[in-house]
Each structure stands twice: as C-alpha cells, then as structure tokens.
C-alpha cells in the first residue's frame, strides 16, 4: 500500500535553508521523485536498475538531493518570503508493479526567523 | 490517512465503454476530483457546501459521472485504440483539513474485444 | 505502440567491424535501459550488453568485452551497437530490447550478423 | 556469472496438455522479497515475448494458463492446458546480477 498523505514532517529548517522530506515505502526499487512548487518542476531524482541490476541515478532538473532507502530529501537554501507556496513530492512507482503515482504535499510558510538573512 | 495507490479495479468495461473508478475516503466532505489522460485534464467535478452546510456540484470540464459517498466515476464511450493511455484520478482534497493532493492512476490498456466497434 | 527496429546487419570478414543501429519510438527512449541480446543460429539468447539512460553506465557480457561498445543518441531515439574484431561465434541475429524496468518487455525484429571468409 | 539450466530440453505436447517446465539457477534469485526470475516465449522465426516477471507475474495480456511458480533456485513455468499456438521455445532469464543470463531453452513440440 502506498500512503498518498505526507503525515510526516515534510518540512526541516535549517541555516536559513529548508529540507523538504519526500518519502517512499522501502519495497520501492525503482522510481521518479519530482519537487513541485505549485505546478512547477523544481528537483527531481530518478533510480532505476539495469537488466544486471546496476542501479542508475539520474537528475533532469539537478537540486542538492539526499537519497536513502526510503526517502529523497531535496534541499532550498537562501529562503525568502518568495519560496512560500505548496510543495508536492511527485513519485512515480516503476518498480515493484504495478506502475503507480503519488502525489503529496504541504504549504511551506516562511517565518522571519527562518529567512537566510534577516535585517537586524 | 489518505490513500494515494490505485489498489483497486480502476477500469471496468462494459459495452464499447469505459467507466474509470476515482475513489477517495468517506471521511472527505469537500474535494475536487480530475480526470487527467496522461497531463491532460479530460474531467473533473468539484464538491462544496455552502454555509447552510447546502451541497454544490460543479464541472468546468463536463463528462459523464456518477458520485457516490466515496467515489467518482467518470465514463468514457466508443472505445478505439487511441484510449490507450495512463489515467489517473486527482483528487484535491479540501475538507477535513489540512489541504492535500494525490494523484492514483493506471495504464488503460484496449483489447480487441473492449472495442466499441469491432470488425467482424 | 512500442517500436524498436534494428538495422545495419549484413556480412563481415572475421577481425572485420559492424556498427548496428535500434530506432525506437512509441516511448520517452531517455527513461529507459537498453540492451542488446543476440541469438546464434539454432542456438539459445545471450546477453551483449546494456546502456542506462543517458550513457554513464555500460555493461557488457564476458564474450564481448573490449571488442564491442555501446552508445545512444537520446536526441535521435537511436541505441547503438559498434562491432570490432568480430569472430565467427559472434554470428547471430541481434535484437535490441528495451528494459522495462523488470524485465525485456520489448523486442526489435533481429538483424542477422554473418561473420565469414 | 549465474548459471541457468533448465529442463527438458524439448517436449512433445498435445493440445490440452498440462506442460511443466524447470528452471535452475546456480544461486538463489531471491532478495528484498523478489525472485528476479523471468519467463519469455519465443516462436519460430520471431523476437522473445515476455510472459513472467518475478517469477510469478504474469506480463499484461498473457493467458492465465500461463503460471510461474518457484523461490530461490529452483523455478516452473506451467501451462495449465496446453493450445497449439504456445508451440516454440521458452526461455528462463535472471536479473539477479550482472551479466543477466539465460537458461538453454525448451522446445515444445506437437505430439
């Protein structure tokens, strides 16, 4: 089963930047996580695993990204009240089948304290 | 929690047709549910109360649907091999709260026999 | 429709080189791994090699190393298969095939590979 | 390298037939939970067609007569009732490590 809802904390602040959290079950081999900000494709990370299953990794729109086992991290630094928006982890299943999306998501407020450079 | 895999029959033929299967949670009063044929948007419906706890129906793009306390069906008619694509239900979640988004899909895959008009 | 059509096969002296081409269509060709795998006359299918998606990663089978590469041009939806120092146990139809992530999902028609005096 | 045997190496079959196949590999194919066996069928004079993946999964559109059974090393495809157009050659493949490698084949044949 794979669980639609980001009933985690998708959001880590830190040093004026932001880890968004996108997870994934751990039975999950090969897949597609997407960063969207609104509609738009911010990030993304692709593993997927040859016929003598080398794991490939790739990135169209290149972010600093963090995999494991069960989670991709994509990370946004120098925060400014213009990041503030819905954010959406957009996996694509290619393996174990069959082929699925999930789509999950939050909103990314951005407090005064979390900005990279606060005027004093 | 909010379920986001297609683990169900999301495709069901019956005479030339297509009906596509969107299920959500009972425990969603308010949603938007589209129909998306690969990125495209081929359907969608929207369900709100009003103060008065009345309820509105609405779709800015019009199929033939059925709702029920924890789904959407949307019908597609005359089957021919150009149906053949990845479908996928957005729903759009509203109340309860907090706001979310999960995509499910699935690949429609058109046999000869599920075909409105079949050469004899 | 998933179409993968091979060409380039034909007649080669043994010590000779063949270059093999595998035009795709009907998919996004840079999502997926690709392979080749030949099949000598009246015999079982062999393993050459493969390409992930955009050719940082190949692979090849034992009885081809350093003879055989294998590119692709994403832009041309094209899988390539150049051939040196052929030997006449490398005479065999070659399919190109596409990894569906799981398994070859997809196959070309074969081009037959002749390697002769 | 793995090493796939499979037996036997032909068979003569009438229509209706239940049709056992057997696959061997050298190491077991098993991990996270998978067995990273595959089934293809191929017909004289034609590519391989994929019929099963994980060892048991059948690909969409292939009949259910077709059934992939097994764990570890030791793996079946079984046609439940035999039709005369799955005469041809199957074929075992791992994608356990690499070089993937393919089991020798086996040629059914019409009685």
């Known amino acids: 089963e794979i669980n639609g809802s980001a009933n985690y904390e998708m959001f880590i602040f830190h040093n004026g930047g932001v880890q968004i959290l996108c997870k994934y079950p751990d039975i999950v081999q090969q897949f597609k996580m997407q960063l969207l900000k609104g509609g738009q494709i911010l990030c993304d990370l692709t593993k997927t695993k040859g016929s003598g299953n080398k794991v490939s990794i790739k990135s169209l729109k290149f972010c600093h990204s963090q995999l494991s086992n069960n989670s991709v991290s994509f990370f946004l630094y120098n925060l400014d009240r213009s990041h503030a928006n819905y954010y959406f982890c957009n996996l694509s299943i290619f393996d174990p089948p069959p082929f699925k999306v999930t789509l999950t998501g939050g909103y990314l407020h951005i407090y005064e304290s979390q900005l990279c450079c606060q005027l004093k | 929690e909010i379920n986001g895999s297609a683990n169900y029959e999301m495709f069901i033929f019956h005479n030339g047709g297509v009906q596509i299967l969107c299920k959500y949670p009972d425990i969603v009063q308010q949603f938007k549910m589209q129909l998306l044929k690969g990125g495209q948007i081929l359907c969608d419906l929207t369900k709100t109360k009003g103060s008065g706890n009345k309820v509105s129906i609405k779709s800015l793009k019009f199929c033939h649907s059925q709702l029920s306390n924890n789904s959407v069906s949307f019908f597609l008619y005359n089957l021919d091999r150009s149906h053949a694509n990845y479908y996928f239900c957005n729903l759009s979640i509203f109340d309860p709260p907090p706001f979310k988004v999960t995509l499910t899909g699935g690949y429609l895959h058109i046999y000869e026999s599920q075909l409105c008009c079949q050469l004899k | 429709e998933v179409q993968l059509v091979e060409s380039g096969g034909g007649l080669v002296k043994p010590g000779g080189s063949l270059k093999l081409s595998c035009a795709a269509s009907?998919?996004?060709?840079?999502?997926?791994?690709m392979d080749w795998v030949r099949q000598a006359p009246g015999k079982g299918l062999e393993w050459v090699g493969n390409i992930d998606h955009d050719g940082n990663i190949i692979n090849f089978a034992p009885s081809v190393k350093g003879r055989f590469t294998i590119s692709r041009d994403n832009a041309k939806n094209t899988l390539y298969l150049q051939m040196n120092s052929v030997k006449s146990e490398d005479t065999a139809t070659y399919y190109c095939a596409r990894w569906g992530h799981y398994a070859f999902d997809s196959w070309g028609q074969g081009t037959l590979v002749t390697v002769s005096s | 390298d793995i090493v796939m045997t499979q037996s036997p190496s032909s068979l003569a079959v009438s229509a209706g037939d239940k049709v056992t196949i057997n696959c061997k590999s050298s190491?077991?194919?098993?991990?996270?939970?998978?067995?990273?066996l595959i089934w293809y069928q191929q017909k004289t004079g034609q590519a391989p067609k994929l019929l099963i993946f994980y060892a048991s999964t059948r690909h969409t559109g292939v009949p259910d007569r077709f059934i992939g059974s097994g764990s570890g090393t030791d793996f079946t495809l079984t046609i439940t009732s035999f039709q005369t157009e799955d005469l041809g050659d199957y074929y075992c493949q791992h994608h356990y490590s690499s070089p993937p490698t393919f089991g020798p084949g086996t040629k059914l044949e019409i009685k």
């Open positions: 190491q077991s194919l098993l991990s996270s939970g998978y067995n990273y």
């Open positions: 009907g998919f996004t060709f840079s999502d997926y791994w």
